[in-house]
Interface confidence: low
Amino acid sequence: DAHKSEVAHRFKDLGEENFKALVLIAFAQYLQQCPFEDHVKLVNEVTEFAKTCVADESAENCDKSLHTLFGDKLCTVATLRETYGEMADCCAKQEPERNECFLQHKDDNPNLPRLVRPEVDVMCTAFHDNEETFLKKYLYEIARRHPYFYAPELLFFAKRYKAAFTECCQAADKAACLLPKLDELRDEGKASSAKQRLKCASLQKFGERAFKAWAVARLSQRFPKAEFAEVSKLVTDLTKVHTECCHGDLLECADDRADLAKYICENQDSISSKLKECCEKPLLEKSHCIAEVENDEMPADLPSLAADFVESKDVCKNYAEAKDVFLGMFLYEYARRHPDYSVVLLLRLAKTYETTLEKCCAAADPHECYAKVFDEFKPLVEEPQNLIKQNCELFEQLGEYKFQNALLVRYTKKVPQVSTPTLVEVSRNLGKVGSKCCKHPEAKRMPCAEDYLSVVLNQLCVLHEKTPVSDRVTKCCTESLVNRRPCFSALEVDETYVPKEFNAETFTFHADICTLSEKERQIKKQTALVELVKHKPKATKEQLKAVMDDFAAFVEKCCKADDKETCFAEEGKKLVAASQAALGL
């Protein structure tokens, strides 16, 4: 349905508050270094313009596309060349190339200062003094650090952020009320950002077909009672929503997501019995709730898959008539029967089935050729099952911190060229799979673990893509989206790596470590561990454990000393010497 003025259409659909918030998010995700005040000014100008178009859709420039309007506005920023360098060249292009250019310059690891949380009283005063500016600043700071954050979901986070301050700034113990809520929002926000980043990578690097396959598998697990046609409709709509958000079309994305939530709730009887509570909530909560809803119960009378996909004489005929539809049906039928499998495993099985049909439907006796196709699935299913079993046993034996350390050593040996901060961040996140998933019963472990690992490994892939240093990482990241995890698991020690020169400065610590939080102290120790492995990739587990135990004792001792700085200087030298001796550096 064509509208005379796209900007007026979206303003009317979304309302002024959401319109302004989404434009701010869009601008902050594109121009990540611009000051808050500059963005607010740009947003206000766009909003005033939108209002003139609402009043008269035929007014000058109201017929322009949103990309044209927003791009023109971004290109008015005076310091574009000084702040963003070659990104300023985007402004010389016409749409749609200009928008593509802006998208390519989004930075997954922008050089921005860490967000430091002020004292609770300071935050509450700022919240009360100017609630609107306070909440806008939250949107701005998250959006510029997470340029692919799912914009309509960020509105939901902002709503919860506001609710936390509204409640807690009136509480007797403000800090006890507020800090756990902010911690929860921070952790959930990082997880949400990473999940969305994988969706965007899937669309941008592997195409719409890859994303649709993922969506068919996931929605079929979640809504096993829904018909294939219903799942297909939801997949088409969901793909449109995420394509828009990943493409920077945040107004369209938010509008279409609201429409999709409305459709799902109007048709819940033919989709899932688990949607009732979600559908009673307000819009932002409703959409979030639907996205997280638990899997519905599987229909009791599902027939064997073999009948339609192996035993039938019409397999090749059905495949030839509409390949993607037939494969989609296979994926739907397999996924709805297997909530215990990860989505990526289901996609591997579908790929194997597709490869078999491609080969067998050209054979003299196709049926004879594909008769045993399900036997080929066995090793594909057993590999993640065995891996998860082994790693959960290791996690239960070591606990989260030491399990992270084991992964740090494992991944540093696999890809030692990767930067130390990236190895620490990714390995810490990989290590969280233990506490996140190993507590689940067998039937829920694989979808929890392997799909979470896909999200974390995508972080490694997008960070590595910015500054590629390892052919092995590039290979695992680019060859196959669904085989990334098996590819990384299969890597062993990189024998081609030339160890780093020993630098005592890397292992010099100061008294400031004593004032760090437990998490920050762990990161310091884990950074040292990665550097040790980079210096001595052939070090054994026992050698590394001995050095790390000595290091922990050294930190504990010096943090208890009266003259901490002297202790760190003197004992540090001894520790470095002992470590060099222990590792033969």
Epitope: K351, T352, L380, D471, N483, P486, C487, A490, L491
Partner: nanobody
Amino acid sequence: QVQLVESGGGVVQPGGSLRLSCAASGFAFRGFGMSWVRQAPGKGLEWVSSINNGGSDTYYADSVKGRFTISRDNSKNTLYLQMNSLRAEDTAVYYCAIGGPGASPSGQGTQVTVSS
């Protein structure tokens, strides 16, 4: 750049044996699972066998199970396929490939012909 060079093919009588080799270069061979796939005349690619990077896990298509053995020597960057009890239907061009059962070949392959 990645290079896979297959060798060891030839003409053999039914029931006979051959040992195929695949010399790998241009990538960290010891880091990747490897596979053998084959293409019979006028047919599509068929997966034959896979081995994990360390050499501890092996997988075979039903059609070759018990007759073929996949192995690797990481110190020589070489993948092997020992083929015994060869049959006429094993006639094909054999390729090695980086990865598991779904892997795609990139080399020239080596021709195996089983004929009396």
